[in-house]
């Protein structure tokens, strides 16, 4: 039950995260005009990954797409790539995780297959979240660098009278959406990986046992058990005759469905 809940919650958290990554990627407010020196501008500038916009006091908003590919800064291209990779991986992860959900039955899919799919989707979500966080962080770093560079050259005087104010940009809403969304996708991925451990078929774990002479009676005792990751050796259905021996952690041993009684 706890495994199903963890898996389900991981899926939902990742779904919200990926939706957020998509939203952040599409948003125009990656960078917004810094109003510190001019809080009452009648023209407000903001930029996204795909276009830049100007909102005027009149209520008119004009957006222009970046119609060039080669003319764009390499950093912007890198951020675009990271966000797209994050979305693609996240989308594939979502698709895989739907089939991996314990509450959904598809034919006679074995638990080991579901465990593998859960782990795969979890890893995809983790990488997707990291891509989004990396993309947003690279853009933020680019903004900080440009901000201080433009601050240094903020006013260029012409005879001391005329001032040309350079537009400075600061963090836009999309950055915060991206960071939160990337974090959620990452958390969702981790939850899926945790759920995977509980989903895998249980396997017998053989501990070192100490033998004691106990007459002629031979008792069958179940060994200790370890949750399988789905990649380990399958050593189910092995009988252990321990002649009254006790494993060191027998207190934590429980019979599995594969044990003979």
């Amino acid at each position: 039950m706890a495994v199903t809940a963890c898996q389900g919650l991981g899926f939902v958290v990742s779904l919200i995260g990926i939706a957020g990554i998509i939203a952040a990627t599409c948003m125009d407010q990656w960078s917004t005009q810094d109003l510190y020196n001019n809080p009452v501008t009648a023209v407000f500038n903001y930029q996204g990954l795909w276009r830049s916009c100007v909102r005027e006091s009149s209520g008119f908003t004009e957006c222009r797409g970046y119609f060039t590919l080669l003319g764009l800064p390499a950093m912007l291209q890198a951020v675009r790539a990271l966000m797209i990779v994050g979305i693609v991986l996240g989308a594939i992860g979502l698709l895989v995780s739907i089939f991996a959900l314990k509450c959904i039955r598809i034919g006679s899919m074995e638990d080991s297959a579901k465990a593998n799919m859960t782990l795969t989707s979890g890893i995809m979500f983790i990488v997707s979240g990291l891509c989004a966080i990396a993309g947003v962080s690279v853009f933020a770093n680019m903004l900080v660098t440009n901000f201080w560079m433009s601050t240094a050259n903020m006013y260029t005087g012409m005879g001391g009278m005329v001032q040309t104010v350079q537009t400075r940009y600061t963090f836009g809403a999309a950055l915060f959406v991206g960071w939160v969304a990337g974090g959620l996708t990452l958390i969702g991925g981790v939850m899926m990986c945790i759920a995977c451990r509980g989903l895998a078929p249980e396997e017998t774990n053989y501990k070192a046992v100490s033998y004691h002479a106990s007459g002629h009676s031979v008792a069958y005792k179940p060994g200790g058990f370890k949750a399988s990751t789905g990649f380990g050796s399958n050593t189910k259905n092995k009988k252990i005759y321990d002649g009254g021996a006790r494993t060191e952690d027998e207190v934590q041993s429980y019979p599995s469905k594969h044990d003979y009684v």
């Epitope: 005009q33 001019n38 009452v40 501008t41 009648a42 023209v43 500038n45 930029q47 830049s52 916009c53 100007v54 005027e56 006091s57 009149s58 209520g59 008119f60 004009e62 222009r64 005329v162 001032q163 040309t164 104010v165 350079q166 537009t167």
Partner: antibody, heavy 120, light 113 residues
Framework: EVMLVESGGGLVQPGGSLRLSCAAS????????MSWVRQTPGKRLEWVAT????????YYLDSVKGRFTISRDNSKNTLYLQMNSLRAEDTAVYYC?????????????WGQGTSITVSS | DIVMTQSPDSLAVSLGERATINCKSS????????????LAWYQQKPGQPPKLLIY???TRESGVPDRFTGSGFGTDFTLTISSLQAEDVAVYYC?????????FGAGTKLEIK
């Protein structure tokens, strides 16, 4: 046809109050940012205040901040300017003007103006 | 505040001749976001409210005769009337539309010589 008609002007004593109204017609009032601009006896034009379409943002000339309040009633297609603590330097013709949507914040339509004289 | 300085204060031009009015701002009215200049020109005839002629420094308002031309960039702007007509006698104002307060120039009185 776009029409802006101001009213509420007159003679007022220093320290007194007055409320100007501007009735708008011929356009979707709620969509447009509206402004008050005054013209002093020396014929200088001076922007006074601006209010955006939804009424959420207002901007004021420093010398009128705290004394004047711009507001709008979109259901009545009316713009207001509440003027308190009036001074002699507030004497002017007050125009109600519309900020054009695609005119780069320029004022594309103006009313005929209403005159205010602040004198004792 | 952005200070708008108009020159000359008054101008007398013969009918059919070119009239040029200058406007200088203390700060750039150019917006890098959309590569536009936020400056407007108005015409005011006696007893009338101002009328918008030019916005965005160079775009003519609809209905304005093509003899009126706006030009300039950043801090220096010009309004040119290519062939002065009798009805062009008025006071012309430039206005900063970039930053609040939306300041106006002192005006240039245009007369017929």
């Amino acid at each position: 046809e776009v029409m802006l008609v101001e009213s509420g002007g007159g003679l007022v004593q220093p320290g007194g109050s007055l409320r100007l109204s501007c009735a708008a017609s011929g356009f979707t009032f709620s969509t447009y940012t509206m402004s008050w601009v005054r013209q002093t006896p020396g014929k200088r034009l001076e922007w006074v205040a601006t209010i955006v379409g939804g009424g959420g943002y207002t901007y004021y000339l420093d010398s009128v901040k705290g004394r004047f309040t711009i507001s709008r009633d979109n259901s009545k297609n009316t713009l207001y300017l509440q003027m308190n603590s009036l001074r002699a330097e507030d004497t002017a013709v007050y125009y109600c003007a519309r900020m054009g949507l695609t005119q780069r914040n320029a004022l594309d339509y103006w009313g005929q103006g209403t005159s205010i004289t602040v004198s004792s | 505040d952005i200070v708008m300085t108009q020159s000359p204060d008054s101008l007398a031009v013969s009918l059919g001749e070119r009239a040029t009015i200058n406007c200088k701002s203390s700060q750039s009215l150019f917006n890098s976001g959309n590569q536009k200049n936020y400056l407007a020109w108005y015409q005011q005839k006696p007893g009338q409210p101002p009328k918008l002629l030019i916005y965005g420094a160079s775009t003519r308002e609809s209905g304005v005769p093509d003899r009126f031309t706006g030009s300039g960039f950043g801090t220096d702007f010009t309004l040119t009337i290519s062939s002065l007509q009798a009805e062009d006698v008025a006071v012309y104002y430039c206005q900063n539309d970039h930053t609040y307060p939306l300041t106006f120039g002192a005006g240039t009185k245009l007369e017929i010589k």
